[in-house]
């Protein structure tokens, strides 16, 4: 199980079941809790455990987070008291109120969404709930909408990329991992169309290529051919010194 750096889990042996006070347990004791033990706790005890884990900044595994979330049928109203990444595993339906959802999704933007793989059901249910919360109708997004979505913006399907390229492309640049097929096609079409914020490929400079670095792998031959060749050569030469940057396909 994941834990604080250099810290090993102490065997619990039922220590969660009835300690005088869960918050009195050490991070080392809290670290190793097995799901089976959490399943036997009352909802109130699980809440106490979640709050204690946050207070002591105990790093939890995905399985532990999922297990805790499953037992927190009615999470505490003070979301700030919960481990940030735990929110990713909670059902957003529990925060569908117009005020509750803004608190929930504002916190979610600070969480590490990539703890959940793109296809995970927990992640898939977050985006539609976030869009509903922020009042997004259709596929047209404002800069504020994209900011409010945080890491969930990386999950927006191609139709959003097509309609909101100006505000969304600069965000997709920094998305970890590859975009899906639908997103790639929409991004390619938007870049080829030459609209804002990058303009026509024929006018791109080395700094445009720098700004586009995360999207370079999606550029097709038609786009690459449109970029002034001197710019491509200069950029390739510069970026070859930094192998962490992904190159456009030749």
């Amino acid at each position: 199980l994941a834990g604080e750096t250099g810290q090993e889990a102490a065997p619990l042996d039922g220590v969660l079941a009835n300690p005088p006070n869960i918050s009195s347990l050490s991070p080392r004791q809290l670290l190793g809790f097995p799901c089976a033990e959490v399943s036997g706790l009352s909802t109130e005890r699980v809440r106490e455990l979640a709050v204690a884990l946050a207070q002591k900044n105990v790093k939890l595994s995905t399985e532990q987070l999922r297990c805790l979330a499953h037992r927190l049928s009615e999470p505490p109203e003070d979301l700030d008291a919960l481990p940030l990444d735990l929110l990713l595993f909670l059902n957003p339906d529990a925060f569908s109120g117009p005020q509750a959802c803004t608190r929930f999704f504002s916190r979610i933007t600070k969480a590490n969404v990539d703890l959940l793989p793109r296809g995970a059901p927990e992640r898939q249910r977050l985006l539609p709930a976030a869009l509903a919360c922020w009042g997004v109708r259709g596929s047209l997004l404002s800069e504020a909408d994209v900011r409010a979505l945080g890491g969930l913006a990386c999950d927006l399907p191609g139709r959003f990329v097509a309609e909101s390229a100006e505000v969304l492309l600069p965000r997709l640049v920094s998305c970890p991992g590859p975009l899906d097929q639908d997103q790639q096609e929409a991004a390619r079409a938007a870049l080829q169309g030459g609209g804002p914020p990058y303009g026509p490929p024929s006018t791109w400079s080395v700094s445009t290529m720098d700004a586009l670095r995360g999207l370079l792998p999606v550029l097709g031959q038609p786009i690459i051919r449109s970029i002034p060749q001197g710019i491509v050569a200069a950029w390739r030469q510069r970026s070859s010194r930094d192998p962490s940057w992904r190159q456009p396909e030749r």
């Epitope: 109203e77 003070d78 529990a94 109120g97 803004t102």
Partner: antibody, heavy 122, light 112 residues
Framework: QIQLVQSGPELKKPGETVKISCKAS????????MNWVKQAPGKGLKWMGW????????SYADDFKGRFAFSLETSASTAYLQINNLKNEDMATYFC???????????????WGAGTTVTVSS | DVLMTQTPLSLPVSLGDQASISCRSS???????????LEWYLQKPGQSPKLLIY???NRFSGVPDRFSGSGSGTDFTLKISRVEAEDLGFYYC?????????FGGGTKLEIK
């Protein structure tokens, strides 16, 4: 204990501006939306709109768009209702009410201020 | 907007009688989460309103069990099984599912 304390009665002339305050205590102010409700003399309750105390974003019912403004002073746990260019039809008692929207069951206006009476007279 | 219509406007009752107030909406107001946020409030003269019932049929804490709410779709009812003197006042239904939220016109419960 949890309460909403509203500012005192106001006597204003048509065309003037009034600003009513609603001070919350006993709970975390930013956890609950603040709603405003109008009650004209001898009439029923009319929902004016609400302000999200977490984001500061107001939402107004159609009849209250334009001259009405909701605002916050979060550090003082206080919500405000300002009415500009007062008209005779604004003469009413204005209530602030906290709306709980936790989980999927507990949605309601559970705590109300005592109301602020605004009299408009030339 | 969802229009809420209450009947009757005035309801004269004898203490100990059952009282029933109806609230009809111009359209269904089920929230996207599947719940119907229909509430009932009582306002006594010179006081602010107080919550009685939330989510159609749930009694708020401290509300006597002689109050009950029911209904679905566009038709809702508040029942008071045995009216007591402290129950007199104005009753309002309220939909809190879709902004703009809306109150019914109110029903005055008075002594016959």
């Amino acid at each position: 204990q949890i309460q909403l304390v509203q500012s005192g009665p106001e006597l204003k002339k048509p065309g003037e501006t009034v600003k009513i305050s609603c001070k919350a205590s006993g709970y975390t102010f930013t956890h609950y939306g603040m709603n405003w409700v109008k009650q004209a003399p001898g009439k029923g309750l009319k929902w004016m709109g609400w302000i999200n105390t977490y984001t500061g974003e107001p939402s107004y019912a159609d009849d209250f768009k334009g001259r009405f403004a909701f605002s916050l002073e979060t550090s003082a746990s206080t919500a405000y209702l300002q009415i500009n260019n007062l008209k005779n039809e604004d003469m009413a008692t204005y209530f602030c009410a906290r709306r709980r929207d936790y989980g999927t069951s507990h949605w309601y206006l559970d705590v109300w201020g005592a109301g602020t009476t605004v009299t408009v007279s030339s | 907007d969802v229009l809420m219509t209450q009947t009757p406007l005035s309801l004269p009752v004898s203490l100990g009688d059952q009282a029933s107030i109806s609230c009809r909406s111009s359209q269904s107001f089920v929230h996207s989460n599947g719940n119907t946020y229909l509430e009932w409030y009582l306002q006594k003269p010179g006081q602010s309103p107080k919550l009685l019932i939330y989510k159609v049929s749930n009694r708020f804490s401290g509300v006597p069990d002689r109050f009950s709410g029911s209904g679905s779709g566009t038709d809702f009812t508040l029942k008071i099984s045995r009216v007591e003197a402290e129950d007199l006042g104005f009753y309002y239904c309220f939909q809190g599912s879709h902004v703009p939220y809306t109150f019914g016109g109110g029903t005055k419960l008075e002594i016959k």
